[in-house]
């Protein structure tokens, strides 16, 4: 539990002390306190580096002090022969005796009190971004006019986050532009636009000045774009660095400017405007668009046709054609579906006749049709050759989609008769 | 047949045998048979068969029987009540519905019906086959298919010849320009048991086919001339016949 | 006179080879089946194989299938037969036959053919 | 395939006798059916085709008979030149089959 003071004696003190001892006392005030040890009495067997007896005085894995021999004050108005003040509200303090004294040695008496530590001073890191504030226990920062302290109650910064912006078109600047921006401030700008139009950024070179990079190329300040899971940025330095047109493909923008303490420029300035959300023109084969476009956007609806000989091969049976709209996230609906080479199917067998089996039975493909010769002739005509036509009919120059038939050949016997010869 | 030779089917594959009674016939096409009048108007679901040379039982076991759907005698053709004392064969064609489709191949093929033309109007001396099953010079039947070639002839070379075993006067026979007279030539002639069978002539247009230009019909006498149904004059009946009952398939 | 021939028998040993033939004359020849009958020394007729007229048909006994080859040549007049893979049950006395309507009707002389090692 | 059965297979007659040769068929033959006559080292010669026609040239003493499988083989008046094998023959399907003979002597 921590104590505003006490009292720390070597054992037996003030008789002497025994050998072969090692005591530790822990000493912790109340937070915001330091502490303030002093020695008011100090005989302790003397030895180089004070090797033999000690008492050590420890701040977290810092040595403070390590003590031994005899002491006395300087003052004669103050029993103080030797004393520590330390910034922090915990301190060890551990005495040690080794297994001989050749004298007789009462070893020591020590003091100690929680002290004020002046926070906004006493350390070489300044806890205040702008103003320190010290009091008994403690310190708080603040902030200048039209600043804010952040939530780490350390850091001020602008309030400079929170807008939502929705319009189609709009501009947007760094805090006090063209005035230097505020140090240490993180700003978030949202923009928001309807589903199926995507935020496109523009900036002038000329209209960019934010601190430079360090020599690690890391920005100090930076401008960062971040539209889904793509991120344009971080962007630094005097006149933009990044694409003058920046197309995120997103109807969702956050726009982040960060700044450190120091070098502030004048900052930026941008516009930006909702587009369409463009929907590629994909290369779909075997098909043509209705309307044909340059670029197709949001809403944008095109009816897809197969070429002779292609049909859809998802959803209506035989289907020749399907629409297909340009969606608010930039893909066309449908896509899934595709224009596929018209199927024929295996063809139709006929009586005393055979057709081979074809290699494919796709559109543009051909087969023959033969009658079993010499015995049947094909008598419709047509030579019995049928392409899969785009109808997914196997069709045939003269007959169409008629099928051949095979006819007996009539009179023809397959032997001669021979008369006899008389 | 008399005076004929030995045949095979290969060299006849239109040749149907009739066994009740035992004729001759010609297939035409996938389900139609031609053949003479007389023979199915005793037996209008008469057994059919093809592709066999002989005509021994067993043979025909292994050959391919057809089955009658309907028989269609021509119209013209007039029934008696006592067919023996016939003396009038005009009109003697009929065509038979098969049940079911014929398969073509070496032994079974059919025969060409004439064409319409003059070019199908047959010459004194035109040569014709005939072949069957029938009374040969040693037989009253014979089991292995036979045939003859014989020339066509003046109809009077038919009415000359004393009809050999007459059921009335000889001035009671018909012959009409239905008719063809054929033989004479070396006694080679059709004969009792081959009736129905074509005679086959040489196509004018494509000399690789025969066509049926008659049908074994009658005779004065066997081994002398014959008399066949002339079916050139009766193309219209048989296309007509063959349109009215097929079945959608065919047409 | 119808006249036939038979030639070309004699002694082989078993699984050799002979072709008999038969001459035909004093008639047409091109218009009859033909048959090769064999008789066994001592023993019945055997009928063996039958050709068509033109040799397009032929049917061949269960006991010679796959071994004897018949086969004819019109323009000569002429019967063969093929015998390969000869057996000693094939020795016989080889006929060659003229076939009217299934009766053999005239018949050669005979050839008579020895199987033996 | 079908069996011939000849019987009986010899037989000793007198000139002049009636001589009957009989065959069976292991199955329905109809009249398919031929009779030969083979002399001591000689070709075999057609008598009788269809079981009861006289081949042309061959005299009328010999006849056949029968249909399905029974036949019958005659000679009314046995001559001394009638001394033979005689074998019958049927044609119903391939394989063409023959009786196993009859051997006719003089007594």
């Known amino acids: 539990e921590p104590t505003m003071y006490g009292e720390i004696l070597s054992p037996n003190y003030p008789q002497a002390y025994p050998s072969e001892v090692e005591k530790s006392w822990d000493i912790e005030v109340p937070e915001g306190y330091g502490i303030h040890l002093y020695f008011t009495h100090l005989d302790i067997e003397l030895s180089e580096n004070c090797a033999y007896d000690s008492v050590q005085i420890i701040s977290g894995d810092t040595e403070e002090g390590r003590l031994c021999g005899q002491r006395s004050s300087n003052n004669p108005h103050s029993p103080i022969v030797e004393e520590f003040q330390v910034p922090y509200n915990k301190l060890q303090v551990i005495f040690k005796s080794d297994f001989s004294n050749e004298e007789r040695f009462t070893g020591f008496a020590a003091y100690y009190v929680a002290t004020d530590i002046n926070e906004c001073t006493d350390f070489v890191d300044v806890p205040c971004s702008h103003f320190c504030n010290n009091f008994i226990g403690g310190y708080f920062c603040s902030c200048p006019p039209e600043y804010f302290l952040h939530d780490d109650m350390k850091n001020c910064g602008v309030n400079c986050s929170g807008d939502v912006f929705t319009a189609l078109i709009g501009e947007i600047a760094s805090p006090n532009y063209p005035k230097p921006y505020p140090e240490n401030s993180r700003c978030e700008y949202q923009i928001r636009l309807e589903k199926g139009f995507q935020v496109v950024v523009t900036l002038r070179r000329e209209d960019f000045d934010v601190e430079a990079a360090d020599s690690a190329g890391n920005c100090l300040d930076s401008l960062v774009f971040v539209a889904g899971d793509r991120q344009f940025g971080p962007y630094c330095g005097h006149g933009f660095p990044g694409p003058l047109n920046i197309e995120t493909k997103s109807n969702a923008l956050d726009i982040i400017f960060q700044t450190d303490l120091t070098g502030q420029k004048k900052g930026w300035k941008l516009r930006y405007h909702g587009d369409p959300m463009p929907c590629p023109k994909e290369d779909t084969p075997n098909s043509v668009w209705e309307p044909a476009k340059a670029k197709y956007v949001f809403r944008d609806v095109v009816q897809i046709t197969c070429l002779d000989g292609f049909e859809v091969v998802e959803g209506r049976v035989g289907a020749t054609s399907f629409y297909s709209t340009c969606q608010s996230n930039g893909k066309w609906s449908n896509s899934k579906l595709k224009c596929q080479p018209v199927d024929c199917g295996i063809p139709e067998s006929i009586e005393n006749g055979k057709v081979e089996d074809p290699e494919s039975t796709l559109f543009g493909s051909v087969i023959r049709y033969t009658c079993e010769e010499p015995y049947y002739y094909m008598e419709n005509g047509g030579g019995g050759e049928y392409h899969c036509a785009g109808n997914g009919s196997w069709v045939n120059e003269v007959l169409g989609p008629e099928l051949p038939k095979c006819v007996p050949v009539c009179g023809v016997p397959r032997e001669p008769f021979e008369e006899k010869q008389r | 047949i008399i005076g004929g030779s030995d045949a095979d089917i290969k060299n006849f594959p239109w040749q149907v045998f009739f066994d009740n009674p035992w004729a001759g016939g010609a297939l035409i096409n996938e389900y139609w048979v031609l053949t003479a009048a007389h023979v199915v108007e005793g037996n209008r679901e008469p057994t059919m068969y093809v592709g066999s040379t002989s005509v021994q039982t067993s043979r025909l076991a292994k050959s391919k029987m057809l089955t009658p759907e309907h028989v269609f005698i021509h119209p013209g053709w007039k029934l008696l009540e006592v067919p023996e004392g016939r003396t009038n064969f005009d009109n003697d064609i009929a065509l038979v519905r098969l049940k079911d489709p014929v398969k073509m191949g070496p032994t079974v093929s059919p025969i060409c019906l004439p064409g319409t033309s003059s070019d199908y109007n047959l010459m004194d001396g035109d040569l014709g086959l005939i072949s069957g099953w029938g009374r040969t010079e040693k037989r009253d039947r014979a089991v292995r298919l036979k045939a003859a070639r014989l020339p066509v002839a003046p109809l009077r070379k038919c009415k000359e010849v004393k009809v050999e075993k007459p059921t009335a006067d000889a001035e009671a026979y018909v012959f009409t320009p239905n008719m063809i007279c054929a033989g004479g030539e070396k006694g080679m002639d059709s004969c009792k048991g081959d009736s129905g069978g074509a005679f086959a002539v040489q196509d004018p247009n494509d000399k690789t086919k025969f066509y049926a230009a008659g049908l074994v019909s009658w005779g004065p006498q066997c081994g002398t001339y014959g008399l066949y149904t002339r079916v050139k004059n009766y193309v219209d009946w048989i296309m007509k016949t063959m349109q009215e009952n097929s079945t959608p398939r065919e047409d | 006179e119808v006249q036939l021939v038979e030639s070309g028998g004699g002694l082989v040993k078993p699984g050799g080879s002979l072709r008999l033939s038969c001459a035909a004359s004093?008639?047409?020849?091109?218009?009859?089946?033909m048959s090769w009958i064999r008789q066994a020394p001592g023993k019945g007729l055997e009928w063996v194989s039958y050709?068509?007229?033109?040799?397009?048909?032929?049917y061949y006994a269960d006991s010679v299938k796959g071994r004897f080859t018949i086969s004819r040549d019109n323009a000569k007049n002429s019967l063969y037969l093929q015998m390969n893979s000869l057996r000693a049950e094939d020795t016989a006395v080889y006929y060659c036959?003229?076939?009217?309507?299934?009766?053999?009707?005239?018949w050669g002389q005979g050839t008579l053919v020895t199987v033996s090692s | 395939d079908i069996q011939m059965t000849q019987s009986p297979s010899s037989l000793s007659a007198s000139v002049g006798d009636r001589v009957t040769i009989t065959c069976q068929a292991s199955?329905?033959?109809?009249?398919?059916l031929n009779w030969y006559q083979q002399k001591p080292g000689k070709a075999p010669k057609l008598l009788i085709y269809?079981?009861?026609n006289l081949e042309t040239g061959v005299p009328s003493r010999f006849s056949g008979s029968g249909s399905g499988t029974d036949f019958t083989f005659t000679i009314s008046s046995l001559q001394p030149e009638d001394i033979a094998t005689y074998y019958c023959?049927?044609?119903?399907?391939?394989?063409?089959?023959f009786g196993g003979g009859t051997k006719v002597e003089i007594k």
């Open positions: 036959a003229r076939d009217e309507n299934y009766a053999l009707d005239w």
């Open positions: 004093g008639f047409t020849f091109s218009d009859y089946y």
């Open positions: 050709i068509s007229r033109s040799g397009s048909t032929k």
């Open positions: 199955q329905d033959i109809s009249n398919y």
């Open positions: 269809d079981a009861s």
């Open positions: 023959q049927h044609y119903e399907d391939y394989p063409l089959t």
